[in-house]
């Protein structure tokens, strides 16, 4: 038997993936555990093997179908269970009735590219990945730029309160190396959270022309 407190958190990427993390205070050692998803209205069900990510937490991804297929809607509820093997039986360690569109976390934006760069400004674009058509334009973005001698945590956040997949960074220093990241969040969902940050895009501003500031 496993004692201690348990936390079971899952997010839907809005298309065909539910990612889950299960934390358990108390020794599990070599126990095999999995997450089982059982939707209330659909014919499929899915299982993934929980793998350790730290001493007391495990994670797995429920792959519901092809990456861009729409497998759930706002009417669906999915019963999610953590099952751990005890001898020949499976024991339910945690359970939740999961409303996918109340618990959204999209994939990180992809395909970041510099559209145009000058001495003091840089125009950058990106794309969203595996995002449901249900959102239409109801998305927001946060972006940050890493300047030399600073950390990501120190970078000020730029907020785009609409579905705008580009940004024009201003007041940059000429001939300087920067890095840029962006993340996305749907406006829908009580427990919806920001996507992971995108892979950083490195760029360099153009040097100032001689004789000009």
């Amino acid at each position: 038997a496993v004692n201690g407190t348990s936390q079971f958190t899952c997010f839907y990427n809005s298309r065909a993936n539910i990612s889950c993390v299960w934390s358990q205070d108390g020794a599990l050692q070599d126990t095999s555990c999995q997450v089982h998803a059982w939707p209330d209205r659909r014919r499929w069900n899915q299982t993934c093997e929980l793998l350790p990510v730290s001493q007391a937490s495990w994670a797995c991804n429920l792959i519901l179908g092809a990456p861009d297929s729409q497998k759930l809607t706002t009417v669906d509820i999915v019963t999610l269970r953590v099952l751990c093997r005890e001898g020949v039986r499976w024991r339910v360690m945690a359970i939740q009735d999961f409303k996918p569109f109340e618990n959204l976390r999209l994939m990180a934006p992809i395909s970041l590219q510099v559209v145009h760069v000058e001495t003091h400004r840089c125009n950058i674009s990106w794309e969203i990945s595996q995002a449901s058509h249900y959102f239409e334009r109801h998305l927001e973005f946060e972006a940050r730029t890493l300047s030399p001698g600073h950390t990501w945590e120190e970078a000020p956040l730029l907020t785009l309160k609409q579905k705008q997949e580009w940004i024009c960074l201003e007041t940059l220093t000429p001939d300087t190396q920067y890095e840029f990241q962006v993340r996305v969040k749907p406006l829908q969902g009580e427990f919806t959270t920001w996507s992971p940050w995108s892979q950083p895009l490195a760029f360099r501003t153009k040097p100032a022309a001689l004789g000009k500031d």
């Epitope: 209205r41 659909r42 729409q70 706002t74 009735d97």
Partner: antibody, heavy 116, light 107 residues
């Protein structure tokens, strides 16, 4: 095998209420939504609402303006659809169905006639 | 509400014919589209779920395709028992809605 058996035909007066039952067998009643659909003679299908027997959660078609109430009795694996303030255009066949990626099993239908 | 429009409303065909019925949704419903067959005096029967999934016991001459707003039910070779009325239905969002039906008659 999965079966949904509905109660028999009813004749009601305008303004009255009717309660149609739907007894399920052959599967775990609490694990699937039960939906209600109606059909006027020679007409198409119209969704009224659904209920999840495991929790009692319901969804209703706003068209019925609070006239419809869906309930279940899990002890006898039976779902109920009550329609109040009956009008002559409620003279239709009422169906219950199990929902599992589409309405995969249906009751035989219950004809309700509203006539003064 | 999502409107579902079927075409044609009625169709005459012969045994052995290949028949196609279309269904258009008023907004994107992804693949959350089901097809039913109904004969006079009987309850509807599920044929196809989630656009192309063949319900158990349904003959393989029935197939479905489409995505987004435009969907198709195809009967590859009509059999005498296929003459009936066919309905599409979306289960993308409440209230669930049906097409108005396509009556398939013997030519």
């Amino acid at each position: 095998q999965v079966q949904l058996v509905q109660s028999g035909a009813e004749v009601k007066k305008p303004g009255a209420s009717v309660k149609v039952s739907c007894k399920a067998s052959g599967y775990t009643f609490t694990s699937h939504w039960i939906t209600w659909v109606r059909q006027a003679p020679g007409q198409g299908l119209e969704w009224m609402g659904d209920i999840y027997p495991g929790s009692g959660n319901t969804n209703y078609n706003e068209k019925f303006q609070g006239r419809v109430t869906l309930t279940v009795d899990t002890s006898i694996s039976t779902a109920y659809m009550e329609l109040s303030r009956l009008r002559s255009d409620d003279t239709v066949v009422y169906y219950c169905a199990r929902e599992r990626g589409g309405f995969d099993y249906w009751g035989q239908g219950t004809l309700v006639t509203v006539s003064s | 509400d999502i409107q579902m429009t079927q075409s044609p409303s009625s169709l005459s065909a012969s045994v052995g014919d290949r028949v196609t019925i279309t269904c258009r949704a008023s907004q994107d419903i992804s693949n959350f589209l089901n097809w039913y067959q109904q004969k006079p005096g009987k309850a509807p029967k599920l044929l196809i779920y989630y656009t192309s999934g063949l319900h158990s016991g349904v003959p393989s001459r029935f197939s479905g395709s489409g995505s987004g707003t435009d969907f198709t039910l195809t009967i590859s070779s009509l059999q005498p028992e296929d003459f009936a009325t066919y309905y599409c239905q979306q289960d993308n969002n409440h209230p669930y809605t049906f097409g108005q039906g396509t009556k398939l008659e013997i030519k």
